[in-house]
Interface confidence: medium
């Protein structure tokens, strides 16, 4: 707590300007009016206040707005935002995308801090859903943002927002997250033609069920191995050798290099060896000829 001391004669601040940077902590406290600071917040960014001076300025705003800052002040916080705690931010009501952008800009180039995470959470909750413009903004600043959300949080993403998602935004998503996003993407891109549809849906295919992979195999999509390796194992297992060959097209040769890795390894174990041999890749580990193949999933369903 900064002690209350009288402002020395002639030092009362008439505006927020560079002359204040040589004010000592107690002088700032005594000579800068909180209301003046609030109305001239946009100037703070253009003045290189020190670490301790920023504490004083924050303290003045906290006293002026004990229930939380108004958006007119929040939008112009600039680097003073970095002094805010998650507890401070929870008191805010941020509704403008411009305010969000201005504060994310301050943290640009750094990992998502607890302050930023709290700000985003407040903003999204205030909006009720992750609309396209918000998602666009968040993924521009934090490509991994989408994958940091829980499947429950992702369920509030409307299909229309999926258009804002870039392939790199999904790099760190796990299968549970893709399970939620894939149906939304399928819906969002449903009116596109075959090749365009595949380009858009490709990044989301880690959440695709078997029947959709079978349908894709009929469309000459030539899926690359990197995409194939990210597919759900349970969705790949029921595919026949012919379907995988059609799905991968010229990329089918890449299966040899991946034969020890999932889902390729598990898929090989489910195929007849003579079917695998038709690929001419030397894939080994299939079911030997003459063995009876029991479809255990069918058996479980019957029992």
């Amino acid at each position: 707590e900064v002690e209350k001391t009288a402002c020395p004669s002639g030092k009362k601040a008439r505006e927020i300007d560079e002359s204040l940077i040589f004010y000592k902590k107690w002088e700032l406290e005594a000579c800068v009016d909180a209301a003046l600071l609030a109305t001239q917040m946009d100037r703070v960014n253009a003045i290189p206040f020190t670490y301790e001076q920023l504490d004083v300025l924050k303290h003045k705003l906290d006293e002026l707005y004990p229930q939380g800052y108004p958006e007119s002040v929040i939008q112009h916080l600039g680097y003073l935002f970095l002094k805010m705690s998650p507890e401070d931010i929870r008191k805010w009501n941020v509704t403008s995308l411009e305010t969000l952008k201005a504060l994310l800009e301050v943290n640009k180039g750094h990992e998502m801090s607890p302050q930023v995470a709290t700000l985003i959470d407040r903003f999204v909750k205030g909006r009720g859903q992750l609309d396209k413009d918000t998602l666009d903004t968040l993924t521009a600043f934090y490509p991994g943002y989408l994958c940091s959300l829980s499947p429950e949080e992702l369920s509030s993403v409307p299909p229309s927002s999926i258009w804002a998602v870039r392939p790199q935004d999904l790099d760190t998503c796990d299968p549970r997250q893709l399970d939620v996003l894939y149906p939304k993407a399928r819906l969002a891109f449903q009116n596109m033609n075959g090749s365009e549809y595949f380009v858009k849906i490709q990044s989301f295919l880690g959440g695709a069920p078997t029947e959709d992979l079978k349908a894709l195999s009929q469309q000459n999509v030539s899926m690359d191995l990197a995409t194939f390796m990210k597919l759900r194992t349970d969705a790949v297992l029921p595919l026949t050798v012919a379907e995988v060959q059609k799905l991968l097209g010229p990329h089918v040769e890449g299966l040899k290099a991946e034969e020890r890795h999932r889902p390729v390894r598990d898929w090989i174990l489910r195929q007849r060896q003579d079917d695998l041999d038709t690929l001419g890749l030397g894939l080994q580990g299939g079911i030997p000829n003459g063995y009876l193949v029991l479809d255990l999933s069918m058996q479980e369903a019957l029992s």
Partner: antibody
Framework: QVQLVQSGAEVRKPGESLKISCKGS????????IAWVRQMPGQGLEWMGI????????IYSPSFQGQVTISADTSISTTFLQWRSLKASDSAIYYC?????WGAGWFDPWGQGTLVTVSS | AIQMTQSPSSLSASVGNRVTITCRAS??????VAWYQQKPGKPPKLLIS???SLESGVPSRFSGSGSGTDFSLTISSLQPEDFATYFC?????????FGGGTKVEIK
């Protein structure tokens, strides 16, 4: 990447004027504070002052106030440090450096330095 | 102005040694301290900000600690490329000031 490139070494006589430069690239030049730091031969580092190129309003360390002038030209992304009348004691390496953080913080990156020699 | 007193002004050490450099501020400055490394003929290079926050790309053998008035930079296992001069800097209040430097030499 963020880079600061300084003008070359200078040799001057006492009483002469001099203007050295620091060109920024790889970031928004207008929106970052640039500082000038002096290092006298075999000595430590001294902060001289800073400028916010967006409004070209320099702030000087009390020790350097009135001794030098800091300016900027945003059209060529360049900051300048100048002397009207050099003294032998101005001989030093001068570095420009970007404030790596908001406000008054630490410096990163630094220019390669400009060696100024003042000798009769 | 806040004075930053660095010690020692020089030290000799061998590769693999643990080295600690200290910096004392003339008044409390929270954790508003940065550390730099400077090699002959080169500009300083930022190692640590906020007293202990390691910059990206800086080897983990470097670490910083302290708050208030006493700060230290530690190199856990000195490598040949670490022989240089190290400076501390306070950014708590104006004018920004640096320590006098510590030269780390090969024993």
């Amino acid at each position: 990447q963020v880079q600061l490139v300084q003008s070359g070494a200078e040799v001057r006589k006492p009483g002469e004027s001099l203007k050295i430069s620091c060109k920024g690239s790889g970031y928004s030049f207008r929106d970052s504070w640039i500082a000038w730091v002096r290092q006298m031969p075999g000595q430590g580092l001294e902060w001289m002052g800073i400028i916010f190129p967006g409004d070209s309003n320099p702030i000087y360390s009390p020790s350097f106030q009135g001794q030098v002038t800091i300016s900027a030209d945003t059209s060529i992304s360049t900051t300048f440090l100048q002397w009207r009348s050099l003294k032998a004691s101005d001989s030093a390496i001068y570095y420009c450096a970007r404030h790596a953080a908001w406000g008054a913080g630490w410096f990163d990156p630094w220019g390669q330095g400009t060696l100024v020699t003042v000798s009769s | 102005a806040i004075q930053m007193t660095q010690s020692p002004s020089s030290l000799s050490a061998s590769v693999g040694n643990r080295v600690t450099i200290t910096c004392r501020a003339s008044q409390g400055i929270s954790s508003a301290v940065a550390w730099y490394q400077q090699k002959p003929g080169k500009p300083p290079k930022l190692l640590i900000s906020y007293a202990s926050s390691l910059e990206s790309g800086v080897p983990s053998r470097f670490s910083g600690s302290g708050s208030g008035t006493d700060f230290s930079l530690t190199i856990s296992s000195l490598q040949p490329e670490d022989f240089a001069t190290y400076f501390c800097q306070q950014f708590n209040s104006y004018p920004l000031t640096f320590g006098g430097g510590t030269k780390v030499e090969i024993k």
